[in-house]
């Protein structure tokens, strides 16, 4: 006869490990007992359990409550056992020693591998601002056994660097993603992908990029100069900009206070029926936590009675 077992049994942390040991005997041969022991190199054998044909299963005190026979039906030639709730410390070499009649004793060894799936974490880097050089966008760390694989999934252009730290029974892998911040990256997903044999599928953690910026400001509303004449109703100026975080707007008049009746509504400056008093230089001030921008326009309200043409100057300043 001969023993059938596995060279390696792989199990995920917390799962039950089946340690196989089957005696493939000739007709009429019987198994008297199967002794299981842990036999790591450099250490004496530590008995796990004894499976006796008459007495049943005896579990050594160190493994009490953790070793069981597989559920019935059971073949009398099957000396396999279940090691419940595998932990990392269970990883190592195991031996089954089968006493048969009349063929004598047989033994076989197997290695138990306990996979420790990682629990990845993603840490964003410092605040990203347009105009910075190469900057850390995020780092992703995963620790497991064996060492996990950490990669990035993103449309954003950048560079990655990885390092690993070996511990006694596991390894921690950290990958960093660096980029040159630009406003086009704002809102883009940056996903850390962790692969490991103990995972049914890759673990993914997504970080949404936030890049602080403030666009140049401009003022709209003076495109048709002929519309700015005395008596016109509904005239308005709109300040155009964009930024992250979203900017706030403030209107002032360079050559004096805002005329009475002029309404400020965020990025819009609304005028009452136009008079010559509304002529002047208006400044839109745009700001967020990252920067501030100004844009100024000259409003010249025309009197239709006069022949002179209307003039409008637009000036932008940063």
């Amino acid at each position: 006869g001969e023993l059938e077992t596995s060279d390696v049994v792989t199990v995920v942390l917390g799962q039950d490990a089946k340690l196989p040991c089957f005696y493939r005997g000739d007709s009429g041969e019987q198994v008297g007992q199967v002794a299981w022991a842990r036999v790591d190199a450099g250490e004496g054998a530590q008995e796990l359990a004894l499976l006796h044909s008459k007495y049943g299963l005896h579990v050594s005190p160190a493994y009490e409550g953790r070793v069981e026979q597989p559920p019935p039906p059971r073949n009398p030639l099957d000396g396999s056992v279940l090691l419940r709730n595998a932990v990392q410390a269970d990883e190592g070499e195991y031996e089954c020693r089968v006493s048969t009649f009349p063929a004598g004793s047989f033994q076989a060894r197997l290695r138990l591998r306990v996979l420790v799936p990682p629990l990845p974490s993603l840490n964003p880097g410092p605040a990203l601002e347009e105009g910075q050089g190469l900057t850390l966008a995020a780092s992703c760390t995963a620790e497991g056994s064996p060492a996990p694989s950490v990669t990035w999934d993103t449309e954003v252009k950048g560079t990655t660097s990885s390092r690993s730290f070996k511990h006694s029974r596991s390894a921690a892998v950290t990958s960093e993603f660096h980029l040159v911040p630009s406003r086009s990256m704002n809102g883009q997903p940056l996903t850390c992908v962790v692969s490991h044999p103990g995972l049914l599928q890759d673990q993914r953690i997504t970080h949404i990029l936030h890049v602080s910026f403030l666009a140049e400001a401009s003022v709209r509303g003076l495109e048709d100069q002929n519309l700015w004449h005395i008596g016109r109703e509904g005239a308005m100026l709109k300040c155009l900009s964009e930024g992250q975080p979203p900017p706030s707007y403030n209107w002032t008049r360079l050559d004096g206070p805002l005329p009475s009746g002029v309404r400020v509504d965020g990025d819009t400056l609304g005028f009452p029926p136009l008079t010559t008093e509304h002529s002047g230089i208006y400044v839109c001030h745009v700001s967020n936590e990252f920067s501030s921008r100004d844009s100024q326009v000259t409003v010249d309200v025309l009197d239709p009675q006069e022949d002179s043409g209307k003039q409008v100057d637009l000036v932008s300043a940063s």
Partner: antibody, heavy 122, light 107 residues
Framework: EVQLVESGGGLVQPGGSLRLSCAAS????????MSWVRQAPGKGLEWVSR????????SYADSVKGRFTISRDNSKNTLYLQMNSLRAEDTAVYYC???????????????WGQGTLVTVSS | DIQMTQSPSSLSASVGDRVTITCRAS??????LAWYQQKPGKAPKLLIY???SLQSGVPSRFSGSGSGTDFTLTISSLQPEDFATYYC?????????FGQGTKVEIK
């Protein structure tokens, strides 16, 4: 025919010592582990000590640990129990018995001697 | 230590009766259980090993059953020579422990 014969019992004062012997015959003595079991007058059975086939595998009941020593001489087919610091509660018939397996669990006691009485009294 | 509890502690029966003695272990012991018979002034005698296996030379009217924590010794038809005290013993752990005994007396 397997035979186990105990000797060495008797009356001893508290604090005294006795050495019990068990002569084995009718089987290969050095192939079997051995045990001592005692029975106080009118009481049940209590396991005392065990020795495996070699002199190193020894176990004791908590009640005798540190006072009793089990040993064997395979060349003489004899099992011993050295009893020191004897107490009144050690009064019992002491039986030697053969184990069916040479290990520290999973054995039966298939042959017993006739017993020897140890009385501890002043 | 594993406690072994036998019941009843004594019973009276007549020749030909079916007698059942139970033994309960304080924790699971698989089938690591033996039954012994002891007559007054004599050494115990092994009747049943591995909970249900009959020792060589023991009459077939003796039988054992059970596994784990609950065990039974049955004498199918009590004979005059069966009046004695019966002990169960576990040898799953050290120290091996005995039940307190069941005395079978003549009714």
């Amino acid at each position: 025919e397997v035979q186990l014969v105990e000797s060495g019992g008797g009356l001893v004062q508290p604090g005294g010592s006795l050495r019990l012997s068990c002569a084995a015959s009718g089987y290969t003595f050095d192939s079997y582990a051995m045990s001592w079991v005692r029975q106080a007058p009118g009481k049940g059975l209590e396991w005392v000590s065990r020795i495996k086939t070699t002199d190193d595998g020894k176990s004791y009941a908590d009640s005798v640990k540190g006072r009793f020593t089990i040993s064997r001489d395979n060349s003489k087919n004899t099992l011993y129990l050295q009893m020191n610091s004897l107490r009144a509660e050690d009064t019992a018939v002491y039986y030697c018995a053969r184990q069916t397996e040479d290990r520290s669990y999973g054995y039966d006691l298939d042959y017993w001697g006739q017993g020897t009485l140890v009385t501890v009294s002043s | 230590d594993i406690q072994m509890t036998q019941s009843p502690s004594s019973l009276s029966a007549s020749v030909g009766d079916r007698v059942t003695i139970t033994c309960r272990a304080s924790q699971g012991i698989s089938s690591y259980l033996a039954w012994y018979q002891q007559k007054p002034g004599k050494a115990p005698k092994l009747l049943i090993y591995a909970a249900s296996s009959l020792q060589s030379g023991v009459p077939s009217r003796f039988s054992g059953s059970g596994s784990g924590t609950d065990f039974t010794l049955t004498i199918s038809s009590l004979q005059p020579e069966d009046f004695a005290t019966y002990y169960c013993q576990q040898h799953y752990t050290t120290p091996p422990t005995f039940g307190q005994g069941t005395k079978v007396e003549i009714k």
